[in-house]
Interface confidence: medium
């Protein structure tokens, strides 16, 4: 007789990443009997919620339920009904909500309250919605990529599962770029972490890790752009801002009230004699780079060495996975290849930024103009942040790997978050190695 497939003994988990610019829902799946193995959890679905980040719903909280409906319904379809009640749902909000909380704790709580009520209406095991710290965001991103790369496994594999994977057990550093914050997390080489706020100790699968992490609030790509505009309009000769970070011929009117809405621009705020100003692109990479560098205060450092704004940063060590917006932007610019040197990236950015806006619109007709217009800034910002902010060099650039997915799972903090909350990363190495995956008898 023919072998029959047994019903799959699997588990599911859902994590919602409530970012500053949008919310994404991730569904993870793993074999129930292998929960403590490294590398067994994988992503089966990503659903991007239509609309902005949840912090933008502060004046219209009644719309949050509808906003989340499509993706939650998608989760209902993907996960078998029999599994619904034991599938945990977690929502983690990041820097967009951190900023809202800085402005008003009450408003942030109101948004989270409505999010929780909306998510409680679904047949899953809702575990809560919270604003995660920048330190958590960095740490969980680091856990995610190293888990997916198999760095926590004690078995040395003879095969490589990703092109840039080395067979040694040296962990990868994690570079995460969002809309409102950016995180850098890695294991420094025999270096004391001089600032306690930046130090994390983990024991994973029987091994100790001393990890450095920092989250730079307001230095995500969107908030960095707001900062740059607020800085530059201070010295503009009138309400026309000739901006090197936008393509020649590009024009956009900005409301001063929008510019000063975010806490990130408070340090540049001043009474301006106009309510609107117009960005006029001039498309000059070098000038754009110079303008961005003014956002990094490198003159103050109370430690042996700093990134910027007086934040301790140990010497860089090993390979780094750069994900989220680091990847999306560089992918769009076709600069994610391992073979592209830092000099080549800079050269390509110079050419790209100098291209006239009308030409760019024609070449990328399918891309939304709002996003398209900001790639020159974002690409230049990434270079500035990595080189001047984090002190990568032309040589160490080749240790940066721009990663979108690893074995089908998105690089980002959500998987690490779920692994931690479901206790799927044991402190000690599991004693026995479970049998193979076979579900046939």
């Amino acid at each position: 007789t023919q072998n029959k497939a047994l019903p799959e003994n699997v588990k599911y988990g859902i994590v919602l990443d409530a970012g500053s610019s949008h919310t994404s829902l991730y569904i993870y799946k793993w074999p129930a009997e292998k929960e403590n193995d490294t590398g067994v959890v994988h992503q089966v679905e990503e659903c991007r919620v239509k609309g902005p980040g949840i912090s933008k719903f502060v004046q219209k909280v009644n719309e949050i339920g509808i906003y989340l409906t499509d993706c939650m319904e998608r989760a209902r379809e993907v996960i078998p009904r029999s599994q619904h009640q034991e599938t945990p749902v977690y929502l983690g909000a990041t820097a967009g909500m951190r900023l809202l909380r800085m402005e008003s704790e009450e408003l942030a709580d109101r948004v989270l309250d409505v999010v929780e009520r909306s998510l409680s209406n679904y047949p899953f095991d809702f575990q809560g919605a919270r604003i995660i710290t920048g330190q958590e965001e960095g740490a969980y991103g680091w856990i995610t990529i190293n888990y997916l790369l198999g760095k926590f496994s004690q078995k040395t594999r003879w095969f490589s599962i990703v092109p840039y994977e080395t067979n040694n057990q040296e962990t990868f550093g994690a570079l995460d770029l969002g809309g409102a914050s950016t995180q850098v997390t890695f294991v420094p080489q025999n270096q004391t972490i001089e600032s306690p706020d930046n130090a994390l100790q983990f024991r994973l699968y029987g091994k100790d890790y001393n990890v450095y992490t920092h989250s730079f609030l307001c230095y995500g790509k969107d908030q960095a752009l707001w900062q740059k505009l607020a800085k530059d309009i201070q010295v503009a000769s009138n309400e026309i801002l000739r901006d090197p970070c936008f393509h020649p011929g590009y024009k956009k009117v900005v409301n001063v009230s929008d510019l000063y809405k975010t806490p990130c621009t408070k340090r540049f705020e001043m009474t301006l004699p106009f309510q609107q100003f117009e960005i006029q692109g001039i498309g000059n990479y070098q000038q754009c780079h110079q303008s961005i560098l003014e956002l990094f205060n490198t003159s103050y450092c109370p430690y042996s060495q700093c990134a910027f704004n007086g934040i301790f940063l140990p010497p860089l060590q090993g390979d780094f996975g750069a994900f989220s917006a680091f990847y999306f932007v560089m992918k769009f610019l076709n600069l994610t290849s391992e073979k592209v040197s830092q000099e080549k990236v800079t050269e390509m950015m110079k050419k790209f930024c100098a291209q006239p806006w009308e030409e760019i619109k024609t070449s990328y007709a399918g891309v939304k103009e709002k996003y398209l217009s900001e790639y020159c800034f974002s690409g230049t910002y990434i270079l500035s942040l990595l080189l001047q902010g984090y002190h990568f060099t032309a040589d160490s650039w080749e240790h940066i790997h721009f990663i979108g997915k690893i074995q089908g799972s998105d690089a980002g903090w959500t998987l690490g978050y779920m692994l931690n909350l479901t206790n799927m990363i044991p402190a000690e190495q599991p004693l026995s190695t479970p049998l193979s995956h076979s579900t046939y008898v």
Epitope: N238, E239, T271, P273, F274, Q275, E278, Q280
Partner: antibody, heavy 119, light 107 residues
Framework: QVQLVESGGGVVQPGRSLRLSCAAS????????MHWVRQAPGKGLEWVAY????????YYADTVKGRFTISRDNSKNTLYLQMNSLRAEDTAVYYC????????????WGQGTTVTVSS | DIQMTQSPSSLSASVGDRVTITCRAS??????LNWLQQKPGKAIKRLIY???TLESGVPSRFSGSRSGSDYTLTISSLQPEDFATYYC?????????FGQGTKVEIK
């Protein structure tokens, strides 16, 4: 030297239209925002409208919003004020003035052109 | 809208007198304030900008100062050519607003 010369004023009946012009010379017109300011007989100065250097931004006083339109032609170094649905209270001397943020806000003014709205 | 309350509305003074005109802003204008001079049949002339910066070519007897939301134009020694109407103008926000004007007449 900087010169601003207004023209186009005259006597007009209520409800009718008029177009004022302001010819600029002696400076790079396309770099400057421009204003219209008026002064009713025996009264003080009242700001009317503003247009940015590239015509992307326009502001109006509530008293003229929806009736007056400010525009410019940088190739002709000329500023315009199209006034529709004129009322008796629009009777005034209309001045144009230039504006460049910080040092040059309303720093040069024209001599003015008189608009009289009367039946 | 920002209201600019200018006082006095008129004053009589003699040549050589020290004259002070004040404007009070109803909201913060952060020093974005001009002082203008108007004479019959002449173009309006800017005397002071940014509350206290003297326009080039304007005699040094004119000065501007600020104390909180009060802005002051001072003519240290009135000259015959100074008899005119003076206006303050705020340019901190739209709509731009003027004070009601101060007419300086010969005593």
């Amino acid at each position: 030297q900087v010169q601003l010369v207004e023209s186009g004023g005259g006597v007009v009946q209520p409800g009718r239209s008029l177009r004022l012009s302001c010819a600029a010379s002696g400076f790079t017109f396309s770099d400057y925002g421009m204003h219209w300011v008026r002064q009713a007989p025996g009264k003080g100065l009242e700001w009317v409208a503003y247009i940015s250097s590239g015509s992307s931004i326009m502001y109006y006083a509530d008293t003229v919003k929806g009736r007056f339109t400010i525009s410019r032609d940088n190739s002709k170094n000329t500023l315009y004020l199209q006034m529709n649905s004129l009322r008796a209270e629009d009777t005034a001397v209309y001045y144009c003035a230039r504006d460049l943020y910080y040092d040059h806000v309303l720093d040069y003014w024209g001599q003015g052109t008189t608009v009289t709205v009367s039946s | 809208d920002i209201q600019m309350t200018q006082s006095p509305s008129s004053l009589s003074a003699s040549v050589g007198d020290r004259v002070t005109i004040t404007c009070r802003a109803s909201q913060e204008v952060s020093g974005y304030l001009n002082w203008l001079q108007q004479k019959p049949g002449k173009a309006i002339k800017r005397l002071i900008y940014a509350a206290s910066t003297l326009e080039s070519g304007v005699p040094s007897r004119f000065s501007g100062s600020r104390s909180g939301s009060d802005y002051t134009l001072t003519i240290s020694s009135l000259q015959p050519e100074d008899f005119a109407t003076y206006y303050c103008l705020q340019y901190a926000s739209y709509p731009r607003t003027f004070g009601q004007g101060t007419k300086v007449e010969i005593k």
